[in-house]
Interface confidence: medium
């Protein structure tokens, strides 16, 4: 059979080959389409309700005035020369329509680095076929399920005409420091080859890189941490977050049983202050925060300090772990 | 990124139990001792139980004792808490803590735990 392809509401023409230019003519028309519960026939005669889907012209030639989504199907004349030669005519009509444009709808302006967004839904109306909805970035095609790209469809039929709308919702995690203005778009593939893809306008969504946590600062006076016996030990926690959160202490990675203070003071040090001091930052939006640890060290008179700044200590050397 | 997940949290009656876990990404999990501090409404952090890299030692706070247990899945990068005989005051958010020698400790977001009947 001959593939056909004809646009809906446009009228086609089909050749009843090896038939008489014109009447009288030995020929009839074989119908099994969308309109048809089996084979109908249709002879030059013509008449009734069928005239206005089909009909025979003075030629032979099959007329469809305006195509439809039932008139996919299978059409075959037989025609019978005047020197009583018989010749077939076979063809497979498939039907299409090219949507409108694609859009992208609900487009994101702002989308946030490191976790999953929404960039917008495509919506193509009035395909058929189907046909697909595909989605790029930068020109290139965006492969669903990976490098954090996932891609949700819906098809949907019109009741009436029987056209299809499609919905295609993007989502991507874009990479830290990646572009900062990437350019997305959609476009539609028609079902049927031969017929040229129709892109949206591309978005431009900005890209928002959250600002890592700050860290939490522990400045410890005198610097060092060394003390002579009886002296004072002031350690202070800066936490640049706002608001403020609730500033906690620990010693060798136990929480202090004090209230929650930005300011620690250990006066007349002893032998049982010494130790790794840290401090532990809760806010309301995330997990806690701790700062470096200090060592807090009793200097005896005669002795040499520690080099300034001996951060780290054991950390969770003792941890309580007796 | 060091990430810290705990899970398990949840509402249980009085002498009911709970098992927490916290899951460890983004660090060599096996190289720190891990612990569990909790901060009840309206107080300040308590630490509640520690075990040490390998496993071998475990520690707890004296309200715990004999009702917690701890323990870790090196394999798995996860430690667990489990939380038996629960009083009413065991209610707090439950933080795992992960820490080792010249390293600021690493926090998890914290999992509920409300013991009540």
């Known amino acids: 059979a001959q593939n056909i392809t004809a646009r809906i509401g446009e009228p086609l023409v089909l050749k009843c080959k090896g038939a008489p230019k014109k009447p009288p003519q030995r020929l009839e028309w074989k119908l099994n389409t969308g309109r048809t519960e089996a084979w109908k026939v249709l002879s030059p005669q013509g008449g009734g309700p069928w005239d206005s889907v089909a009909r025979v012209l003075p030629n032979g030639s099959l007329f469809l005035p305006a195509v439809g989504i039932q008139d996919e199907g299978i059409f075959r004349c037989q025609a019978m020369n005047r020197n009583g030669k018989e010749t077939k005519s076979n063809y497979r009509v498939r039907v299409y329509q090219i949507p409108g444009k694609p859009e992208i709808v609900d487009s994101a302006s702002e989308l946030t680095a490191g976790v999953p967004n929404k960039v917008g839904t495509c919506v193509s109306e009035g395909s058929y076929p189907a046909g697909t909805l595909s989605w790029h970035l930068d020109g290139k095609p965006l492969v669903p399920n990976e490098k954090g790209v996932s891609v949700k469809e819906q098809t949907r039929r019109h009741p009436e005409t029987g056209l299809f709308t499609l919905q295609s919702e993007l989502m991507v995690t874009p990479a830290r420091g990646g572009d900062p203005r990437p350019t997305f778009s959609c476009s539609f593939s028609p079902g049927l080859p031969r017929h040229r893809a129709l892109r949206t306008a591309p978005i431009q969504p900005r890209v928002w890189e959250p600002v890592p946590l700050e860290e939490v600062q522990l400045v410890v006076e005198p610097e060092g941490g060394a003390v002579a016996p009886g002296g004072t030990v002031t350690l202070t926690c800066e936490v640049p977050a706002q608001p403020s959160p609730q500033i906690h202490w620990m010693k060798d990675g136990v929480p202090l049983p004090l209230p929650p203070s930005p300011v620690l003071i250990l006066p007349e040090i002893g032998p049982q202050d010494q130790g790794t001091y840290s401090c532990v930052a809760t806010h309301s939006s995330h997990g806690p925060q701790e700062s470096r640890a200090v060592s807090i060290s009793i200097i005896e008179p005669g002795e040499e300090g520690p080099t300034a700044g001996s951060v780290g200590g054991s950390g969770l050397g003792t941890l309580a772990l007796a | 990124a060091v990430q810290l997940v705990e899970s398990g949290g949840g509402l249980v009656q009085p002498g009911g139990s709970l098992r927490l876990s916290c899951v460890v990404s983004g660090f060599t999990f096996r190289s720190y001792a891990m612990s569990w501090v909790r901060q009840a409404p309206g107080k300040g952090l308590e630490w509640v139980s520690a075990?040490?890299?390998?496993?071998?030692?475990?520690s707890y706070a004296g309200s715990v004792k004999g009702r917690f247990t701890i323990s870790r899945d090196n394999a798995k990068n996860t430690v667990y808490l489990q939380m038996n005989s629960l009083e009413p005051e065991d209610t707090a958010i439950y933080y795992c803590?992960?820490?080792?020698?010249?390293?600021?400790?690493?926090w998890g977001q914290g999992t509920q735990v409300t013991v009540s009947s």
């Open positions: 075990i040490t890299s390998g496993g071998e030692s475990t």
């Open positions: 803590n992960a820490r080792r020698v010249g390293s600021p400790g690493s």
